[in-house]
């Protein structure tokens, strides 16, 4: 079945050294346990996190994200997942793309992370 992938339309903000969540979901909501789900960074498609065959595929990760990411899967049965990145670095700033692949059908959503210096940070909004 077909679906859309939805991510944050507003930039996600994080402080250096903190953790940040990048949420992503499919619509209409459906069980994504059997799908391939991942995040990569354009333009060179460096793998930030990959989930396939019901498991996190740590071996496919770009070295700079090894040990810093966690896929929150408690709502994957509804097609909702979140990538948590720990110990945020300035180099994490920029674009991320989340994708869901169901057999040969794949959709994705782009999102943006803004990283700020904690000594010069003003709460957004």
């Amino acid at each position: 079945g077909q679906f859309r992938v939805i991510g944050p339309r507003h930039p996600i903000r994080a402080l250096v050294g903190d953790e940040v969540e990048l949420p992503c979901r499919i619509s209409p909501g459906k069980n994504a346990t059997g799908m391939e789900v991942g995040w990569y960074r354009p333009p060179f498609s460096r793998v930030v996190h990959l989930y396939r065959n019901g498991k996190d595929q740590d071996g496919d990760q770009a070295p700079e994200y090894r040990g810093r990411t966690e896929l929150l899967k408690d709502a994957i049965g509804e097609g909702k997942v979140t990538l948590r990145i720990r110990n945020v670095r300035f180099s994490d700033e920029g674009g991320f793309t989340c994708f869901f692949r169901d057999h040969s059908y794949q959709e994705e959503a782009a999102m943006e992370l803004k990283v700020e210096d904690p000594f010069y940070w003003v709460s957004p909004g």
């Epitope: 996600i12 994080a14 402080l15 903190d18 940040v20 969540e21 619509s27 948590r84 957004p124």
Partner: antibody
Framework: QVQLVESGGGLVQPGGSLRLSCAAS????????MNWVRQAPGKGLEWVSA????????YYADSVKGRFTISRDNSKNTLYLQMNSLRAEDTAVYYC????????????WGQGTLVTVSS | DIQLTQSPSSLSASVGDRVTITCRAS??????LAWYQQKPGKAPKLLIY???SLESGVPSRFSGSGSGTDFTLTISSLQPEDFATYYC?????????FGQGTKVDIK
């Protein structure tokens, strides 16, 4: 099952302060964004504030910016709303509600707690 | 900020009627729109998300449509328990604004 229970409402004088709490259970609290929504007597719904799962991002309606502070304690599965410099127009039922990462509608709501600002 | 304008603000209908409520956004919000039902003294209940997807457990007589700026909630055959106030909400961007509500009462 998912449950959200608000507390801390009551009668307060204009200019006063109040802290609302929302105790969450039945889900992985730290993995969800949380919101406060209010409803003045006989009026419609007004979104007030939101906070990300980690607490690192917060958002406010213009009507409360600089006066209200949203926070959360993930170790206690509790959401808070610190309300300062209260005005008569802040009188409302305050609901907490969860959403998924700020990219979903509010699928679970608490029962609400009434805040009355009056002298 | 994105404003949502619902119409009508109230309507009277009979059991079995087809009821349509519209919600117009001041700027495009893709499909990031939800519809809620609220009864007096109760918290709102999610009916429709992503403009047209039915929330689990909600009767199929409720449906939503639209994209961009114009959205519709339809109740195909009004039931006694459907007399309530209905709100649209956008979650495209903060602040996550609500429409002013549409009260559906008995004719």
């Amino acid at each position: 099952q998912v449950q959200l229970v608000e507390s801390g409402g009551g009668l307060v004088q204009p200019g006063g302060s109040l802290r609302l709490s929302c105790a969450a259970s039945g889900f992985a609290f730290r993995n969800y964004a949380m919101n406060w929504v209010r409803q003045a007597p006989g009026k419609g719904l007004e979104w007030v504030s939101a906070i990300s799962g980690s607490g690192g991002s917060t958002y406010y309606a213009d009507s409360v910016k600089g006066r209200f502070t949203i926070s959360r304690d993930n170790s206690k599965n509790t959401l808070y709303l610190q309300m300062n410099s209260l005005r008569a127009e802040d009188t409302a039922v305050y609901y907490c509600a969860r959403d998924y990462g700020g990219i979903s509608p509010f699928d679970y709501w608490g029962q609400g707690t009434l805040v009355t600002v009056s002298s | 900020d994105i404003q949502l304008t619902q119409s009508p603000s109230s309507l009277s209908a009979s059991v079995g009627d087809r009821v349509t409520i519209t919600c117009r956004a001041s700027q495009g919000i893709s499909s990031a729109l939800a519809w809620y039902q609220q009864k007096p003294g109760k918290a709102p209940k999610l009916l429709i998300y992503d403009a047209s997807s039915l929330e689990s457990g909600v009767p199929s007589r409720f449906s939503g449509s639209g994209s961009g700026t114009d959205f519709t909630l339809t109740i195909s055959s009004l039931q006694p328990e459907d007399f309530a106030t209905y709100y649209c909400q956008q979650f495209n961007s903060y602040p996550h604004t609500f429409g002013q509500g549409t009260k559906v009462d008995i004719k």
